[in-house]
Interface confidence: low
């Protein structure tokens, strides 16, 4: 139903606390450089305005669209051009062009210092002084670093953060209580951020159909007892919610998400028995619980897929009459039977099936043409299975650090034009997938691996789009969302790359490396490894092993020496010469 004042409607639905949090997130995600105090001032102004509209929906400006109100607020900031440069040019445009312009200026990699966690004592003092302000600061710091974070989920994590502090600041050993809790929140929030970023990229770069297909596959896996019509209804609402959040319409997104959770709880009998435990929780926890819900058990006696999608005489008729519905049904039926497959695999299978029908339904004997379609789709299943098995074996053999090194070599050979710090960052992220997924049972390994890889490659693609350096990376990132991972896997040594000239500085180390924390020490060594591959992209595995072994021995020797710096100065050039000889 239409409301006279959209902002009053959302204020009433969400309540003042969540309303203010969402306004703060909106501002922080768009104006990533502004100080916290400036945002707080704007949040209070917007909230006061919303309250005035609640009191009188006909009051001046209350009928304006929320996006327009936000745009007007941003464009009224006196220092806008000074702080944000060409973002200020957006203010010359009319909505909806102004909104699109603001979105294009969101920075996925803002030049901000890492979000360091203060000492527990300092955290608790600040929290006790003013916990609303403290939680506001958390929302601000996360939002400006993650400008596409799923806003209602961020409110949930802020609530978890608040609960952890409420509990632990009273504990005798604050650090022992807080550290594991905040580490867990941080890890889950980072995954949540990456998941939402992939959803937004899917919508923005590949369109609504791609996102809906992704959602059908995921929801069919989670709710295999629900009918296709029910899954479709949820997917339609979920698409609206996701589009709103990705578009920066966070008040609408959070409100509509609440509505979707309410709908799912009202219809839980026809969706999933697992919803019961979620539906008794309060608003934020309820929606989060549904998002993370354990999949329901498969219905018994499911007929063979071939009955409806190969043997049925009406296959081509059904395909021609309602292509998307027929393919959607195929994706639903396939996904609910295969909770162990990744979303990417399911979408590639559906795409393969579609391509087969496109070809066969135009032929004289369609059935003869598509009769063996499932056999022909088998390589789409075997390829990722084999890849996961090989990589997990390598991970088990080498451990996380060694596995990261192997990936650093592999990805440098695939895209040597990418900067060394970026290659190390992604090798480390890809390597951590081994830790996350390889210890899981066979049934979960495959989906865990490919679903995480999709998140990591999406981030790589987003940052590469900002500063493109490799045509092969651009090709893998833009041609097809579902084929990104197979595309990267298929890349081998870049034959067009001219090896980097040898620079001794890239392999020169000093005594300060000895006192670095283990993680930073690893990163330094991995930077040298990547530089080495850029210098000799076709070096054999044996040569690399020898060089890395010599390198480790050199570091150990010099870090154990009485006069460390003298050892580095004397033995460093010898090591460089030895490495060059090994790789010659």
């Amino acid at each position: 139903e239409a409301h006279k004042s959209e902002i009053a409607h959302r204020f009433n639905d969400l309540g003042e606390g969540h309303f203010k949090g969402l306004v703060l997130i909106t501002l922080s995600q768009h104006l990533q450089k502004s100080p916290f105090e400036e945002h707080v001032k704007l949040v209070n102004e917007v909230t006061d305005f919303a309250k005035a509209c609640v009191a009188d929906e006909s009051a001046q400006n209350c009928g304006k669209a929320i996006a327009t109100l936000f745009g007007d607020k941003v464009c009224a900031i006196p220092s806008l051009r000074e702080t944000y440069g060409e973002l200020a040019d957006c203010c010359a445009k009319e909505d909806p062009d102004r909104v699109e312009c603001f979105l294009q200026h969101k920075d996925d990699n803002p030049n901000l210092p890492p979000f360091e966690r203060p000492e527990p004592e300092a955290l608790c003092t600040a929290f006790k002084e003013n916990n609303d302000r403290f939680i506001g600061h958390y929302l601000y710091e996360v939002s400006r670093r993650h400008p596409y974070f799923y806003a209602p989920e961020l409110l949930y994590y802020a609530e978890k953060y608040k609960n952890a502090l409420t509990e632990c600041c009273e504990a005798a050993d604050k650090a022992a209580c807080l550290t594991p809790k905040l580490d867990a929140i941080k890890e889950k929030a980072l995954v949540s951020s990456a998941q939402q970023r992939l959803k937004c990229a899917s919508l923005q770069k590949f369109g609504e159909r791609a996102f809906k297909a992704w959602s059908v596959a995921r929801l069919s896996q989670k709710f295999p007892k629900a009918e296709f019509a029910e899954i479709s209804t949820i997917v339609t609402s979920l698409t609206k919610v996701t589009k709103e959040c990705c578009h920066g319409d966070l008040l609408e997104c959070a409100d509509d998400r609440q509505e979707l959770a309410k709908y799912m709880c009202e219809h839980q009998d026809s969706i999933s028995s697992k919803l019961k435990e979620c539906c008794v929780k309060p608003t934020l926890q309820k929606a989060h619980c549904i998002l993370e819900i354990q999949r329901d058990e498969l219905p018994t006696e499911l007929p063979d897929l071939a009955v409806d999608f190969v043997e049925d005489k009406e296959v081509c008729k059904n395909f021609a009459e309602a292509k998307d519905v027929f393919l959607g049904t195929f994706l639903y039926e396939y996904s609910r039977r295969h909770p162990e497959y990744s979303i990417g695999m399911l979408l590639r299978i559906a795409k393969g099936y579609e391509a087969k029908l496109e070809k066969c339904c135009a032929e004289a004997d369609p059935h003869a043409c598509y009769a063996k379609v499932f056999d022909e789709l088998q390589p789409l299943i075997d390829e990722p299975k084999k890849l996961v098995q090989q990589n997990c074996e390598l991970f088990d053999k080498l451990g996380e650090y060694g596995f990261q090194n192997a990936l650093a070599v592999r990805y440098t050979q695939k895209a040597p034009q990418v900067s060394t710090p970026t290659l190390v960052e992604y090798a480390r992220k890809l390597g951590s997938v081994g830790t996350k997924c390889c210890s899981l049972p066979e049934t979960e390994r495959l989906s865990c691996t490919e679903n995480y890889l999709a998140l990591i490659l999406n981030r790589l693609c987003i940052l590469h789009e900002k500063t493109p350096v490799s045509e092969r990376v651009t090709k893998c990132c833009t041609e097809s969302l579902v084929n990104r991972r197979p595309c990267f896997s298929a890349l081998h040594v870049d034959e067009t790359y001219v090896p980097k000239p040898f620079h001794a500085d890239s392999f020169t180390f000093h005594a300060d490396i000895c006192t670095l924390p283990e993680k930073e020490k690893q990163v330094k060594k991995q930077m040298a490894l990547v530089e080495l591959v850029k210098h000799k992209p076709k070096a054999s595995e044996e040569q690399m092993k020898t060089v890395m072994g010599d390198f480790a021995a050199f570091l150990k020797k010099c870090c154990d020496a009485d006069n460390k710096e003298a050892c580095f100065t004397e033995d460093g050039p010898k090591l460089v010469a030895k490495c060059q000889a090994t790789l010659a």
Epitope: P180, D183, A184, I185, Q294, D396, K436, L440, P441, E444
Partner: nanobody
């Protein structure tokens, strides 16, 4: 619904050892991360140790590192906690917990199912 039943607690002297067991039923045991927590009288519940689904990863609180060992036998749906060199400050009710998340955590709110606990008393 997973049910967890702990056993093996008792009264021992400082320096002694104990082996706690936790038997699980009602779920696919090998898909759960298993953890041990403890709660001393009048204190908060605290994390002790956790083990991943295939026993590849184990994690310990600093206060028990080197003294306690966690292990699991997926064929028997059981997780164990070996307590060596026990100290009076180890006196507590020890709880077994199961988490269905794909990563293991030291945070109690990440665990979905809990046992009733088994009491360990270390006293001279």
């Amino acid at each position: 619904e997973v049910q967890l039943v702990e056993s093996g607690g008792g009264v021992v002297q400082p320096g002694d050892s104990l082996r706690l067991s936790c038997a699980a039923s009602g779920g696919t045991f090998s898909t759960y991360v298993m953890g041990w927590f403890r709660q001393a009288p009048g204190k908060e519940r605290e994390f002790v140790s956790a083990i991943s689904q295939n026993s590849i990863h184990t994690y310990y609180a600093n206060s028990v590192k080197g003294r306690f060992t966690i292990s699991r036998d997926n064929s028997k749906n059981t997780v164990y906690l070996q307590l060596n060199s026990l100290r009076p400050e180890d006196t507590a009710l020890y709880y077994c917990a199961a988490s269905r998340f794909t990563s293991w955590y030291t945070a109690d709110y990440e665990y979905d199912y809990w046992g009733q606990g088994t009491l360990v008393t270390v006293s001279s």
